[in-house]
Amino acid sequence: YDFTNCDFQKIEADYLRTISKDLITYMSGTKSTDFNNTVSCSNRPHCLTEIQSLTFNPTPRCASLAKEMFARKTKATLALWCPGYSETQINATQAMKKRRKRKVTTNKCLEQVSQLLGLWRRFIRTLLKKQ
């Protein structure tokens, strides 16, 4: 999906109002320097591409993020403010239902959400720098 035509201001507002709090709640208790910064993004569409990938693409050591509250809200936000996004996700959702796993917060998942915080931060800040 090409995130170029999204309403970035509306996505920012949704992130600051709800998604950020769910991410923080998920990370609560972790140490600041537990996880290295390994993922970055350079502009708003690129940030959203990376955010979508980390949030919704299961990895061998972290399969369950898509069912977390912050992921559900991220999906709703992208569907609302990115034209045609929800249509592109129908097939992906069907595939995800087939490989649903028991929900476990692993260290690898915490590391992934730590990267998400960094990506969202860049998304918001890139937006501010453009204004």
């Epitope: 709640t25 140490k31 600041s32 290295n36 910064n37 800040r125």
Partner: antibody, heavy 118, light 107 residues
Framework: QVQLVQSGAEVKKPGASVKVSCKAS????????MHWVRQAPGQRLEWMGE????????DYNQNFRGRVTITVDMSASTAYMELSSLRSEDTAVYYC???????????WGQGTLVTVSS | DIQMTQSPSFLSASVGDRVTITCKAS??????VAWYQQKPGKAPKLLIY???MRHTGVPSRFSGSGSGTEFTLTISSLQPEDFATYYC?????????FGQGTKLEIK
Amino acid sequence: QVQLVQSGAEVKKPGASVKVSCKASGYTFTSYLMHWVRQAPGQRLEWMGEIDPSDSYTDYNQNFRGRVTITVDMSASTAYMELSSLRSEDTAVYYCALTGTINYFDYWGQGTLVTVSS
Amino acid sequence: DIQMTQSPSFLSASVGDRVTITCKASQDVVTAVAWYQQKPGKAPKLLIYWASMRHTGVPSRFSGSGSGTEFTLTISSLQPEDFATYYCQQYSSFTFTFGQGTKLEIK
């Protein structure tokens, strides 16, 4: 162990610029964010900005935007904070501090006193 | 920016006393609050993060609590080395802000 060692005290005239350094050791320099926080006499701590050494991405507190520039020298594992157009209110102790993506500060430099006086 | 308001600004107490410092955020910061101790001429030292987690090496007499907009730092039994200035900080928003500080003095 992680160590952040800052440059020495500076005295500057109003309108001038100052550049403070922070040499990092004891960890992989590109792994964490480097922040700058200042404290004017009797005032609260004030976050100025940060840099991600892995790609030199910077982010600044809007109160300082346009006056502060944070850079890194990868080969020397050193971060720099330059503040321009100095005024007397910029007299403060300037600290570098380290975080991951979660931004509370578990490692600090020893501080650098910058005095702005005519 | 989110404002962090500490109270009291000054606090006089004696060794062995139990003291509580309060920090109020101008909007919901969930539990993204840290507490620092600072002594004259020194850098701040992290005491508490995530509102209630003690940093490595911090004595058990220091505890933190709270969520949303109201947070407290409690020292259960003051020791001579605890007389210092204490700051809260929120890291929920993207511009990190600190309280104005609470100076804890010997009565």
